[in-house]
Amino acid sequence: KFSKQSWGLENEALIVRCPRQGKPSYTVDWYYSQTNKSIPTQERNRVFASGQLLKFLPAAVADSGIYTCIVRSPTFNRTGYANVTIYKKQSDCNVPDYLMYSTVSGSEKNSKIYCPTIDLYNWTAPLEWFKNCQALQGSRYRAHKSFLVIDNVMTEDAGDYTCKFIHNENGANYSVTATRSFTVKDEQGFSLFPVIGAPAQNEIKEVEIGKNANLTCSACFGKGTQFLAAVLWQLNGTKITDFGEPRIQQEEGQNQSFSNGLACLDMVLRIADVKEEDLLLQYDCLALNLHGLRRHTVRLSRKNPIDHHS
């Protein structure tokens, strides 16, 4: 229920966050699950715990395993599990699938590639970026904050992009790399005021308490390459990331080109283990581009499970 996969490369830094949530003031203890051995908090150790974070500085293949984090609230101890896998560095240039983060898509006018997991680290700009193991050079490539911007994107820009940065811990530097695929949508077309295909305005979505639920926000913005088109979910008028409920996350879908040639975007809102209080929230699907913003509101209602008798 409270478990998360994390991976990294040997001799690089890896920082993992406890999957169990809690207030920042709460003490978090970490253990190596197989031996129940406590992870030290002293920073002189190669592997040490720092609040909600578990730090491997640097990581070793032998560190692979399941780690238990216990968040100590004023009342009860709450447990989460981090499944960590550390891989040997590849001698060739190919990055295996198991080391890849989620694929992102771009277009001629919208080509941001975010560096995965970087928010967990203490790093300073600029990032180094590589495509298929080659360092990116030239004025078309701009490393900005935690993402790469590619100007005048072409089909040939598709590929595997690796960000490399330095994590600093008490004056010591550790390398971190993360790789994700980038795909290019190369179309010519036009832009329209956003049209939300789903959900319908004021839709009532039936969900079952205790089950998982998905809401898809799908909108079309015109034909071909779109500039500054986005779909997103809000909860009670608040961004998902700011709302602070770990069970409710949004997951970006791929650009879609339907049979009518329209350029559309999806954003899936995943609600894990639906709770009664989720029914009190207002779910807004927002679609926006240069023409403006359109909003469709969804509310959840309780679906009573039907008894199936043989």
């Epitope: 949530q21 207030k23 003031s25 004023p74 009342t75 009860f76 308490i209 283990d273």
Partner: antibody
């Protein structure tokens, strides 16, 4: 919707015990710690303790530790608070309550209607 | 045990006036929750985590503070705001409440 429905009013003699029930509905009972808070007539609120219905683990306010027992029945989604060796100053309204999101301990968002326990000889 | 002291004990104001309720804590806490209670009713959560407005609570209610001093503010009193208001800490066990501030509307 989330509901906490408590048992009815009780009149007890000093030295007796009382057991108040709190039936939860509208959410997964084992996902949330349930707390008990009492309020003497014209007085403020006093936290008595809490139970994790999943494990049955309890944390009691030291003031009540010797006399209070909190239990939970997962099969009926009902929590119980038993207070023994009653005295007149235990006359109060007893509430069961829970947080909005459990991990964040974000205040008591849901309350039962309260159970008046009167201790009188 | 963390002791919570609320002041004033009673606050008597006219509709439209600003109400400021204080909660002083015997040792520093990270967050404060506030509740409203009307006669014969269970308490109702108003503010959680010091400054976050609970669902369904009017925006005239706000919370602030840190460490040992916290404040609940009602920017413009309405007649229905007549009630007793309690602060509560969830920083350490036992969880404790303040003694309450009674708000009367003239």
């Amino acid at each position: 919707q989330v509901q906490l429905v408590q048992s009815g009013a009780e009149v007890k003699k000093p030295g007796a015990s009382v057991k108040v029930s709190c039936k939860a509905s509208g959410y997964t009972f084992t996902d949330y710690e349930l707390h008990w808070v009492r309020q003497a007539p014209g007085q403020g609120l006093e936290w008595m303790g809490t139970i994790d219905p999943e494990t049955g683990d309890t944390v009691y306010n030291q003031k009540f530790k010797a006399r209070v027992t909190m239990t939970a029945d997962k099969s009926t989604s009902t929590a119980y608070m038993e207070l023994s060796s009653l005295r007149s100053e235990d006359t109060a309204v007893y509430y069961c309550t829970r947080a909005f999101y459990n991990d964040y301990d974000d205040g008591f968002a849901y309350w039962g209607q309260g159970t008046l326990v009167t201790v009188s000889s | 045990e963390i002791v919570m002291t609320q002041s004033p004990a009673t606050l008597s104001l006219s509709p439209g006036e600003r109400a400021t309720l204080s909660c002083s804590v015997s040792s520093s806490v990270s967050y404060m929750h506030w509740y409203q209670q009307k006669p014969g009713q269970a308490p109702r959560r108003l503010i959680y985590d010091t400054s976050k407005l609970a669902s369904g609570i009017p925006a005239r209610f706000s919370g602030s503070g840190s460490g040992t001093d916290y404040t609940l503010t009602i920017s413009s009193l309405e007649p229905e705001d007549a009630a007793v208001y309690y602060c509560q800490q969830w920083n350490s066990s036992p969880l404790t409440f303040g003694g309450g501030t009674k708000v009367e509307i003239k």
